[in-house]
């Protein structure tokens, strides 16, 4: 006996798909070898029709598929626009000839069923409704007009002119005549069942001038979509159940062995395993709605059908629409973070990656709310304005070519836990999501930037400086100017890196930004931060004001108010000043050719007169003395 | 829930032939999969056959024991699932029970069925 299986009989009707899934012993070479699926002929040689090593014969050309499930120790053979000519006798198996392992399937396809003349054929979905049409003489104009089912011989009343439905058709069968028309009558069954299919007689009059009318009515059952996606990546299932249940709830449910769990409905409904990844979208007014999830698990791989229903919950006789979703384990996804905890206070660099055939895409973070359907408002973007609520705290940092984009949050609050997603305008499947989790803070930040209050005047210098502790003594330290369009990053100087890191001196690690001389357009979040070539690290946010000089104050050098606020050395504000011009810097190297061109330059943009000296103050005094 | 109820067992001679049904209620708009499975005295319940279908479509699945002998069908008006046995043999003595799914991962786990009837007995006397 063979250790392969699978479904020894498949019969089906021309134009219809099959999907036969062969099952095969869970051994590393079983999962690595050839799978085919062949034609046996009379001759005994089994011809290859498609085989996982790509091949396709002409005759599947477009029309077939075969992919293997290493996880599940399957193959699937997908088979569409099925035709007589596919009646006949194959193998699926394993090996690199066709005489390796293999089981026999038999598949049939017949035709569409034909009926006498004067049968007509319905073929509805489940849930859908059906009008059948009933003609009459005009002698039976008056007469008792009736609908009945064939069961074996006797044909059992579904519903009759005098107001009679039998009980399993109550509130679903209507029969009723249009306008003045004398000859014809119609009978509506609405949530059409399985069981409701079979060959339907309608009447008008009685005994041997009764007009009779056969109707075969076929109910199908929703053809599963099949869906091949791979692991953390995302599927969107489109569901268009008609107009009729337009205003009813919609919901998407899973099939487990026994019912279908509902995973979300738009009554607010949404199963725990897909908080954080799930958004139901009405799509327009006539029912259409999608579902989206995102990082995709293993175990979310099985059998979904969408729905409506007043209740939110699948019930019987009510439109559906089925999808079979495979989740590929061999993913060109990369494994990422799916959750990053962050403190009060504190801040957050969140790794986002994307297709690197894509660089060039539109790279978005929206945050995911949980309310009724869910939805996912982007907070920032490649050229998305940073949302209300988010400015100076949140900045999305390109890295083109890394396959790679960073989102930074700062001035974290327990407000911003919750669930997040990466997203670009490229290829959807590269979607994430992250659980951002914020605990209270218990210790002080490990970045601090003093002043605290910061206010710049005018036309004079401002230094701002940014504590580090030693564990960020390694990594290249930074400033940037806050906009809405990203943290523009500002030159820097390390000069801490010169000291040995033997001797780091925890209260003294300094990186220094300097504007000089202030002007109005310098108002604005700066962000002090750590990074490792492109890794971004811990970030914290200040906000510089800027403000006229009032009259007849004294002119004091807020970097001396500064130092003396913190009841600095006196060696040490008076290195500040000392490298007052030195803190001059510019963004663009083309302006570094003549650096007097730069001071006179009266209208240069204000990152063209910002910088960050980051060093040591212990290291500076030491140099001054 | 689905509720199953088997019928048609009873004593037969070796090489005769018996029909069993399997007739569903309840919730059965999600039921896709429906097998028969046996459970010979002293020995595990062991699956026969299922028959799973999608559409007009239908995926017949057969135990190596009783390919060629044992045929599977369903009337999908009257919720109802068939065992066509031929050529019984004493070995094939056993309760059969029918059983119910939404889903099929694999035709021949047992627990890949939610629902179970409560048996009915085939007795093949040589």
């Known amino acids: 006996q063979s250790p392969i299986f699978g479904p020894q009989d498949v019969s089906s009707i021309e134009g219809n798909s099959v999907s036969i899934t062969c099952y095969y012993p869970d051994t590393s070479v079983n999962r690595h070898t050839r799978k085919y699926w062949c034609r046996q002929g009379a001759n005994g040689y089994c011809a290859t029709l498609i085989s996982s090593n790509g091949y396709l014969s002409k005759e599947y050309s477009g029309r077939a598929s075969l992919i293997n499930f290493p996880e599940n120790s399957t193959f699937v053979i997908n088979i569409a626009h099925l035709t007589q000519e596919d009646t006949g006798s194959y193998k699926c198996g394993l090996g690199t000839t066709n005489r390796g392992l293999f089981f026999d399937v038999s598949l049939e396809v017949s035709q569409v069923p034909e009926f006498p003349n004067d049968t007509h054929v319905y073929t509805k979905d489940i849930g859908r409704t059906v009008t059948i049409e009933c003609r009459f003489k005009e002698g039976n104009a008056h007469s008792k007009k009736s609908l009945c089912k064939k069961r074996g011989e006797a044909c059992e009343v579904v519903i009759d002119s005098t107001e009679y439905v039998d009980p399993s058709y109550k509130d679903r069968a209507i029969l009723f005549m249009k306008g003045t028309s004398r000859d014809i009558f119609y009978v509506n069954i609405s949530h059409l069942i399985p069981s409701d299919a079979g060959l339907y007689v309608c009447q008008a009059g009685e005994g041997p001038s009764a007009d009779k009318n056969n109707a075969d009515l076929q109910v199908l059952e929703p053809e599963p979509e099949l869906l091949y996606k791979d692991l953390r990546s995302s599927v969107t299932f489109e569901c268009d159940l008609g107009r009729e249940v337009a205003n009813d709830a919609k919901y998407l449910c899973r099939k487990n062995k026994e019912t279908c769990d509902v995973i979300i409905n738009t009554l607010g409904k949404r199963d725990p395993a897909f908080e954080g990844r799930i958004l139901l979208t009405p799509r327009d007014d006539n029912g259409r709605f999608s579902v989206l999830i995102t990082g995709l698990r293993k175990e979310d791989a099985g059998h979904y059908q969408c729905g409506a229903h007043s209740s939110g919950l699948p019930q019987e006789g009510w439109p559906v629409q089925a999808w079979q979703l495979f989740v590929n384990e061999e993913s060109t996804i990369p494994n990422s973070r799916s959750v990053v905890k962050g403190v009060t206070g504190g801040s957050v660099a969140i790794v986002c990656p994307y297709n690197p055939k894509e660089s060039s895409s539109l790279k978005y973070w929206c945050h995911w709310e949980a309310d009724e359907n869910g939805r996912c408002p982007v907070l920032v973007g490649t050229q998305a304005l940073v949302q209300e609520g988010y400015e100076g705290r949140l900045a999305l940092f390109d890295q083109p070519g890394s396959g790679a984009y960073t989102v930074i949050l700062n001035q974290l609050t327990t407000q911003d836990s919750g669930f997040y997603w990466c997203l670009t305008d490229g290829d959807s499947r590269w979607r994430t999501t992250i659980e951002l989790q914020v605990a209270e803070a218990t210790k002080k930040p490990d970045l601090e930037v003093t002043p605290q209050n910061a206010t710049a005047v005018i036309g004079e210098t401002f230094t701002i400086s940014c504590h580090y502790p030693c564990k960020f003594y390694s990594q290249e330290k930074y400033w940037c100017k806050w906009s809405n369009d990203g943290c523009h990053i500002l030159p820097s100087h390390d000069e801490g890196a010169r000291q040995s890191s033997v001797s780091c001196d925890q209260s003294s690690q300094i990186v220094s930004m300097t504007l000089n001389p202030v002007k109005k357009e310098d108002e604005g979040w700066y962000w002090c931060g750590v990074k490792e070539g492109q890794v971004y690290g811990e970030t914290t946010a200040i906000y510089v004001a800027v403000e006229e000089r009032t009259r007849g104050s004294p002119h004091i050098n807020p970097t001396d108010a500064n130092a003396r606020a913190k009841d600095a050395p006196e060696e040490e504000a008076m290195e500040s000043s000392v490298r007052e011009d030195e803190n001059k810097a510019n963004l663009d190297p083309r302006l570094f050719a003549d650096e007097r061109e730069i001071q006179n330059a009266g209208d240069q943009a204000q990152e063209n007169r910002a910088s960050g000296n980051a060093g040591s103050a212990g290291g500076q005094s030491g140099s001054s003395k | 829930e689905v509720q199953l109820v088997e019928s048609g067992g009873g004593l037969v001679q070796a090489g005769d032939s018996l029909r069993l049904s399997c007739a569903a209620s309840?919730?059965?708009?999600?039921?896709?999969?429906m097998g028969w499975f046996r459970q010979a005295p002293g020995k595990e319940r062991e699956f026969v056959a299922t028959?799973?279908?999608?559409?007009?479509?239908?995926?017949?699945y057969y135990a190596d024991s009783v390919k060629g002998r044992f045929t599977i069908s369903r009337d999908n008006a009257k919720n109802t699932v068939y065992l066509r046995m031929n050529s019984l043999k004493p070995e094939d003595t056993a309760v059969y029970y029918c059983?119910?799914?939404?889903?099929?991962?694999?035709?021949?786990?047992?627990?890949?069925?939610?629902?179970w009837g409560q048996g009915t007995l085939v007795t093949v006397s040589s």
């Open positions: 028959i799973a279908w999608s559409g007009s479509t239908n995926y017949k």
């Open positions: 059983a119910a799914s939404t889903v099929l991962t694999d035709p021949r786990r047992l627990n890949e069925y939610a629902n």
């Open positions: 309840g919730r059965t708009f999600t039921t896709y999969v």
